[in-house]
Interface confidence: low
């Protein structure tokens, strides 16, 4: 079998034990609480082992090398990076009971940045209180083989390059591996070496194809506008440099005095129409992207954008037409935090003449429509070259209006 562990585009967990250890030996005297969490691959939530802060157990373990495996590898042999002794590789068989009973020590998540230049691994220690008192270092050893031979493949130690991971926040370290564009489809082999208080934790060999783990940059240019048919159009553009189509997750919340609506939609286009929009409401929207047709990682969410609708919404907001034609305006009217029922809406032209009720239509409970038939040319009124069409609540008209140019 292939001795390297294939990384999926998810968070995964590293569990460690001293060589030749048994369950009873494993750090239990030092205050580690037993744990019976399952191994079903849900790695997002991790139970934090509890250590006493005296450090006595660490001094006992000084110079010990802990060999680590991934939770999903319980019943497999687990290969380690090349060891110091003559460049040979250890393959350790691990008792699966250990993994059922002892929760893991590290969460690891890796991805290729959206610019396709840097492969990043975040190594998060679950010994939250432990490493503040110890000299904590994380190194990532990696190799991009020129030619991948048949499995099993374990490069010799000398062929690995090492990067020092940035652990400015002690519990979370960032390891950056530069990947040439020409090698994005190649298999990257790597392993982690974590040192703390003289104890070395060593991961198994991991393999990954960077192109399958792209985390795009967040979508750009998120904006919203009301369409001529009264929908809210949410639009954005895909981030630059992504070499494949993306799917997008759009989450938006609508907040008005009458309703709070939240939605979460997956789309492959760079826009989304939201219907039944309400006047006097605010819409907060965020969007993120992920590879459409293969494995990948969701980008971070874009910066939230907020769009606020007016108390009176006209759609379309203006119409330009020719003499003799028929046109319609729609309106939704909100007054004193209530949406005016459409049957109570009246329409006025230029606040001077009431439009006959025969020209009204009730489209829905809240949407009123007025239609103009066989239109005459607009007569200029001072500097105004259009007719102002007002949607009113009985005798009270909002200052906003729609514009009719004939």
């Amino acid at each position: 079998f292939n001795l390297s562990y294939p990384i999926t585009p998810w968070r995964f967990k590293l569990s460690c034990m001293p060589p030749n250890s048994t369950y009873d030996y494993f750090l239990l005297p030092a205050g580690l609480s037993k744990n019976t969490s399952n191994s079903n691959g849900h790695y997002e939530t991790a139970v934090e082992p509890k250590f006493n802060s005296s450090g006595t157990h660490f001094s006992n373990l000084s110079k010990t090398t802990f060999h680590c495996c991934f939770r999903s590898e319980q019943d497999r042999n687990c290969s380690l990076c090349a060891d110091n002794i003559e460049g040979k590789t250890f393959v350790s068989t691990v008792n699966s009971l250990v993994f059922q009973q002892i929760d893991a020590n590290w969460n690891i998540q890796c991805w290729l940045k959206g610019d396709l230049k840097l492969f990043i691994c975040y190594v998060e220690s679950l010994f939250k209180n432990l490493f503040r008192n110890y000299n904590y270092k994380v190194h990532l050893l990696y190799v991009l083989p020129e030619v991948l031979e048949d499995s099993p493949l374990v490069p010799q130690k000398g062929s690995f390059q090492m990067v020092h991971c940035n652990c400015s926040v002690h519990e979370c370290c960032e390891c950056l591996v530069p990947v040439p564009t020409a090698k994005l489809n190649d298999t990257l082999l790597m392993c982690l070496k974590i040192t703390s208080g003289g104890v070395i934790f060593q991961s198994p060999l991991m393999s990954v194809q960077p192109i399958n783990m792209v985390k795009p940059d967040p979508p750009l240019g998120l904006h919203m506008e009301i369409t001529d048919d009264g929908n809210l159009k949410i639009s954005w553009s895909s981030p630059p440099l992504v070499p494949f189509p993306l799917q997008y997750q759009v989450k938006y919340s609508e907040n008005s005095t009458t309703v709070i609506r939240e939605a979460d939609k997956i789309v492959s286009a760079t826009s989304l129409l939201v219907d039944s929009i309400l006047p006097g409401s605010s819409y907060e929207v965020q969007v993120r992207g992920k590879r459409l047709d293969g494995p990948g990682i969701w980008s971070d969410w874009s910066t939230p954008r907020v769009f606020t609708t007016q108390d009176v919404i006209y759609f379309p907001p203006k119409i330009l037409t020719s003499v003799g034609s028929n046109v319609s305006f729609h309106c939704i009217y909100k007054k004193e935090n209530k949406i005016v029922p459409s049957k109570e809406i009246v329409w006025w032209m230029n606040l001077a003449e009431k439009i006959p009720q025969s020209q009204y239509d009730v489209v829905s409970d809240h949407v009123s429509k007025v239609t103009f038939f066989n239109l005459n040319e607009t007569k200029p009124r001072g500097k105004f070259t259009y007719d102002a069409v007002y949607c009113c609540n009985e005798h009270e008209c909002h200052h906003r209006y729609a514009e009719l140019y004939v």
Partner: antibody, heavy 117, light 108 residues
Framework: QVQLVQSGPEVKKPGASVKVSCKGS????????ISWIRQAPGHGLEWMGW????????RFAQKVQGRLTMTTDTSTSTAYMELRSLRSDDTAVYYC??????????WGQGTLVTVSS | DIQMTQSPSSLSASVGDRVTITCRAS??????LNWYQQKPGKAPKLLIY???SLQSGVPSRFSGSGSGTDFTLTISSLQPEDFATYYC??????????FGQGTRLEIK
């Protein structure tokens, strides 16, 4: 190709208004917004405001809010910028710029507005 | 409002030189940064959008980098037509959209 063509230079007295037009061609006018940006002589760029060509939605810089009116006419693919109560420090070249997912990717040639008594 | 500060305000260089202009935002703007070139009497021209993406038609000697608060525009090998004023601009937090004060690039 995408082009934005602006109206010609204007000379105005303090307190007057000026209206500058910007005609777009080579793209679907209603799919984009138009921003107005000005540049006083020897100075940098100052964003004034933005209008969505499809919905008429607007955003303003605080400095000109209340004096600036932006409109669009999608039938002629033209955007208009009107600045009222002109002062001498409004003397500048006024630019329109197409504003989509890549802000200001195409610009008009600029319109010099001189405010002088 | 987010302030954009460019440095230097002006610099002199020769044809063939490698030139770097920096732009700093008063708060993090992610990658929502654009670079423009303006020649005397002309409208600005978009060079780089989203911090590092080259606008179509712009020569590859122009490149942008950075994210968060610190950004750079690099011209790898100056050509005679590159002498101009360069502006950075953020579109992260709007309104208002804000520009840097400009960097004037002159012939040495």
């Amino acid at each position: 190709q995408v082009q934005l063509v602006q109206s010609g230079p204007e000379v105005k007295k303090p307190g007057a208004s000026v209206k500058v037009s910007c005609k777009g061609s080579g793209y679907t006018f209603s799919w984009y917004g138009i921003s107005w940006i000005r540049q006083a002589p020897g100075h940098g760029l100052e964003w004034m405001g933005w209008i969505s060509a499809s919905s008429g939605n607007t955003r303003f810089a605080q400095k000109v809010q209340g004096r600036l009116t932006m409109t669009t006419d999608t039938s002629t693919s033209t955007a208009y910028m009107e600045l009222r109560s002109l002062r001498s420090d409004d003397t500048a070249v006024y630019y329109c710029a197409r504003t989509g997912t890549r802000p200001f990717d195409y610009w008009g040639q600029g319109t010099l507005v001189t405010v002088s008594s | 409002d987010i302030q954009m500060t460019q440095s230097p305000s002006s610099l002199s260089a020769s044809v063939g030189d490698r030139v770097t202009i920096t732009c700093r935002a008063s708060q993090s703007i992610s990658s929502y940064l654009n670079w423009y070139q303006q020649k005397p009497g002309k409208a600005p021209k978009l060079l780089i959008y989203a911090a590092s993406s080259l606008q179509s038609g712009v020569p590859s000697r122009f490149s942008g980098s950075g994210s968060g608060t610190d950004f750079t525009l690099t011209i790898s090998s100056l050509q005679p037509e590159d002498f101009a004023t360069y502006y950075c601009q953020q579109s992260y937090s709007t309104p208002p959209i804000t520009f840097g004060q400009g960097t004037r690039l002159e012939i040495k």
